[in-house]
């Protein structure tokens, strides 16, 4: 074993080095001292460290760790945050386009429905946006509300234009009849299936990205234990106390210390791997009815088909509803 | 190619659907994200090693510090001595992760469960029997996927992978995305989001 170099007789080197960490020299002894009060850098002989210096070294060691962790995660963090932001924005654009397409379909094919239809379509797509961002809204209820709201307008404007505008009473009856008579056929159910599946997947995809960010942010800001702080100090700074400024920790020793300090972090590894592989599985399945871009941008067409379906069955429907909602209509015509 | 109503107008009561194509879709961007994420799959297990390699550690020096003294780099003392009589490393590991780490692990377990539940198994038979009730059967085929876009009077089917997101034509170009080394021209920066 090589003999230790003679300690710095004046602690001058240690002082100039410590000054970079802590301007103000009063903590560094003029000459080596016994250091009996030291708790981390336990001296084998005279030392140029004081208790206060030790505390500063521990603080610096923890800061170093935090900076090293945050530097390590920078690429990963940027990758997930940028994509989370891009997808969130893109999904909002898809919703906006889908709303515009649906409004355009009404304007071009059913201009008499437009004022009210625009309102109902707007509410529906607002709910879609909120759902994607995590709101506690039921997708089936959203679709039912859209068709419940649309049918009275379709009935009074397209199928039975003679009815007065203020048919509030009949509206309630028509909303009920819409479901009981399945006036839109299976289109509402079809839209429910497609929209709920695609939106659920979209929502969980965004949730997963946001959790990924949370995981990285958590490990970036870990507060390391006192024991870990001491181990880091001992590894990185205790050599300074002996005037050994240029000496570096042994590689194997560093690995042992890091495994100890980061045992908790490394436990995340298994679940992190699973997270990436599960996210990959989800993404592989995001097509056709599991792709909100595909589903929402096709909605205008399915809604158009559903109205055509009502028109095709208008004769039968008008008769049935005439009987069903007769009471409401009589009150209306008085 | 993908059809979608960019410019809707009436022509003999038929909804005409224009289409525009762009180089990248949301689905291709998703796949690209996964490929890049997979390069970070060992991120947490590699962290201790990364920190040692990026903090000052003796590489070429003959002597190194083992926490108590200067030793030869390849001696037994290089790893062992520094830990002796100091803190019990085994105890440090046995304490288990701190509460925030346990919480984040629980959240990961939960999202992993959700992701697995939501994942679409390959070749899953999609719900049928959608047209058995109501006045008459709708115009859809028996695979609900085919209903997207409908088949009403002159309607186009809206295909998957719609390439329309030029509106998000912020400069999320090749240079922006970790893992790419191509160079971008200033024009690239402004053309289209989804073309990395």
């Amino acid at each position: 074993q090589p003999p230790p170099p003679p300690p710095d007789a004046t602690c001058h080197q240690v002082r100039s080095f410590f000054q970079r960490l802590q301007p103000g020299l009063k903590w560094v002894p003029e000459t080596p001292v016994p250091g009996s009060d030291l708790q981390v850098c336990l001296p084998k002989g005279p030392t140029c460290c004081s208790r206060k210096m030790e505390e500063k070294y521990q603080l610096t060691a923890r800061l170093n760790m935090e900076q090293l962790l945050q530097s390590a995660s920078m690429e990963l963090k940027f990758l997930i945050i940028q994509n989370a932001a891009v997808f969130q924005e893109a999904f909002e654009i898809v919703v906006r386009h889908a709303k515009n397409y649906t409004n355009a379909m009404f304007k071009n094919n059913y201009p008499s429905l437009t004022p009210q239809a625009f309102e109902f379509v707007g509410e529906f797509f607002t709910d879609v946006s909120l759902y994607i961002l995590g709101s506690d809204i039921n997708v089936d209820d959203m679709v039912n509300e859209l068709f419940d709201s649309l049918f009275p307008v379709i009935y009074t404007q397209l199928m039975n234009p003679g009815l007065p505008d203020s048919a509030l009473d009949i509206n309630e009856c028509l909303r009920g009849a819409r479901r009981d008579l399945k006036v839109f056929g299976n289109f509402p159910k079809l839209i429910m299936t497609q929209v709920s599946k695609s939106l659920q997947v979209t929502r969980i995809f965004l949730q997963a990205l946001n959790l990924g960010i949370e995981v990285i942010n958590t490990t970036d800001h870990l507060k390391f234990s006192k024991d870990c702080g001491r181990m880091l100090t001992r590894m990185w700074y205790c050599s300074y106390c002996q005037g050994l400024m240029m000496v570096k920790p042994c590689g194997g020793y560093c690995n042992v210390v890091m495994q100890g300090c980061m045992a908790g972090v490394v436990e995340i590894d298994k679940y992190w791997r699973e997270y990436i592989l599960s996210l990959e599985e989800l993404v592989n399945g995001m097509y056709r009815i599991y792709d909100m871009e595909n589903v929402l941008l096709g909605l205008f067409s399915t809604i158009h088909d559903s109205i055509q379906y009502v028109q095709k069955n208008a004769g039968k429907l008008t008769t049935t509803i005439g009987k069903l909602c007769a009471h409401s209509q009589q009150r209306q015509y008085r | 190619s993908a059809y979608y109503p960019e410019d809707l107008f009436i022509d003999k009561k038929v909804l005409k659907v224009a289409h525009v194509e762009h180089e990248e879709t949301l689905s291709s961007r998703r796949r690209e994200l996964i490929q890049k994420l997979k390069s970070f799959i060992s991120f947490y297990s590699a962290l201790p090693g990364y920190i040692c390699s990026h903090s000052p550690v003796a590489e070429n020096d003959t002597l190194c510090w083992n926490g108590q003294e200067l030793v030869e780099r390849y001696s037994q003392k290089a790893a062992r001595n520094g830990m002796k009589n100091q803190f019990n490393l085994h105890e440090l590991k046995m304490k288990g992760p701190e509460p925030v780490v346990s919480q984040i692990i629980d959240k990961l377990k939960h999202i992993n469960q959700l992701l697995r539940t939501m994942s679409v198994p390959k070749g899953r038979v999609l719900d049928k029997n959608l047209d058995e009730e109501g006045f008459e059967s709708g115009d859809c085929g028996d695979d609900e996927d085919e209903c997207i876009g409908g088949s009403g009077d002159g309607m186009m089917k809206v295909k998957n992978q719609l390439r329309f997101l030029a509106e998000l034509a912020y400069d999320l170009d090749v240079d922006d995305v970790p893992g790419n080394n191509q160079q971008a021209t200033p024009k690239d920066n402004e053309i289209s989001t989804f073309h990395n």
């Epitope: 900076q67 090293l68 945050q70 530097s71 390590a72 920078m74 690429e75 963090k77 940027f78 990758l79 945050i81 940028q82 989370a84 932001a85 891009v86 969130q88 924005e89 960010i213 942010n217 | 590699a46 990364y50 990026h54 000052p56 998000l168 912020y170 400069d171 999320l172 090749v174 240079d175 922006d176 995305v177 970790p178 893992g179 790419n180 080394n181 402004e190 989001t193």
Partner: antibody, heavy 119, light 112 residues
């Protein structure tokens, strides 16, 4: 076109605070991070810190902890930096810059805001 | 913190000459990903810094090919093959691999 427009010059008294802004356009604000740099006399550039507009995650250079506070307003695509307890040492030009991590760290900068601290 | 040391402090050149600026980091600036986030900026009087080179040797868009970067580990160099009048100003190296990110002290390129 990527643009970062900073607020105008500020003359402030010692001990006071100042908040400078950086309005951005031409890119997805939440998809990048914004960082700030101090340019002092004698060609010294000091990196202050960064903030992610997406979720306000930030990191400060230890040297500026307690001196600078970074915030964002997503609705107006604007980043802010507040400097407090100002002294003559804080007189400098402050730049905001858009962060892109993966290839380059920063390619787009604001025009700078001159802060003069004087009694 | 990683200390970035630039030399020379001032570099007088004649137009058309080659110029070379050196930058040394106090420790390796290879990131955990294997990338080296070493960048070169030019700041002209009254202007904000402009990115010239990223990841040691990649020219940013619109930067003339007379600018080139090289190096690895801790030693890096920016070369200008034929100096033009518009190249005058202060050049900074910058490392973005380890937080806090740090700039070199600057090298002033001026006319002899």
């Amino acid at each position: 076109e990527v643009q970062l427009q900073q607020s105008g010059p500020e003359l402030v008294k010692p001990g006071a605070s100042v908040k400078i802004s950086c309005k951005t356009s031409g890119f997805l604000f939440t998809g990048h991070y914004m960082h700030w740099v101090k340019s002092s006399h004698g060609n010294i550039l000091d990196w202050i810190g960064y903030i992610y507009p997406y979720n306000a995650i930030s990191f400060y250079n230890q040297k500026f902890k307690g001196k600078a506070t970074l915030t964002v307003d997503k609705s107006s695509n604007t980043a802010y930096m507040e400097l407090r307890s100002l002294t003559s040492e804080d007189s400098a030009v402050y730049y905001c810059a858009r962060g892109d991590y993966g290839n380059y760290v920063t390619a787009y900068w604001g025009q700078g805001t001159l802060v003069t601290v004087s009694a | 913190d990683v200390l970035m040391t630039q030399t020379p402090l001032s570099l007088p050149v004649s137009l058309g000459d080659q110029a070379s600026i050196s930058c040394r980091s106090s420790q390796s600036i290879v990131h955990s990903s294997g990338n080296t986030y070493l960048e070169w900026y030019l700041q002209k009087p009254g202007q904000s810094p402009k990115l010239l080179i990223y990841k040691v040797s990649n020219r940013f868009s619109g930067v003339p090919d007379r600018f080139s970067g090289s190096g690895s580990g801790t030693d890096f160099t920016l070369k200008i093959s034929r100096v033009e009048a518009e190249d005058l100003g202060v050049y900074y190296c910058f490392q973005g691999s380890h937080l806090p990110w740090t700039f070199g002290g600057g090298t002033k390129l001026d006319i002899k």
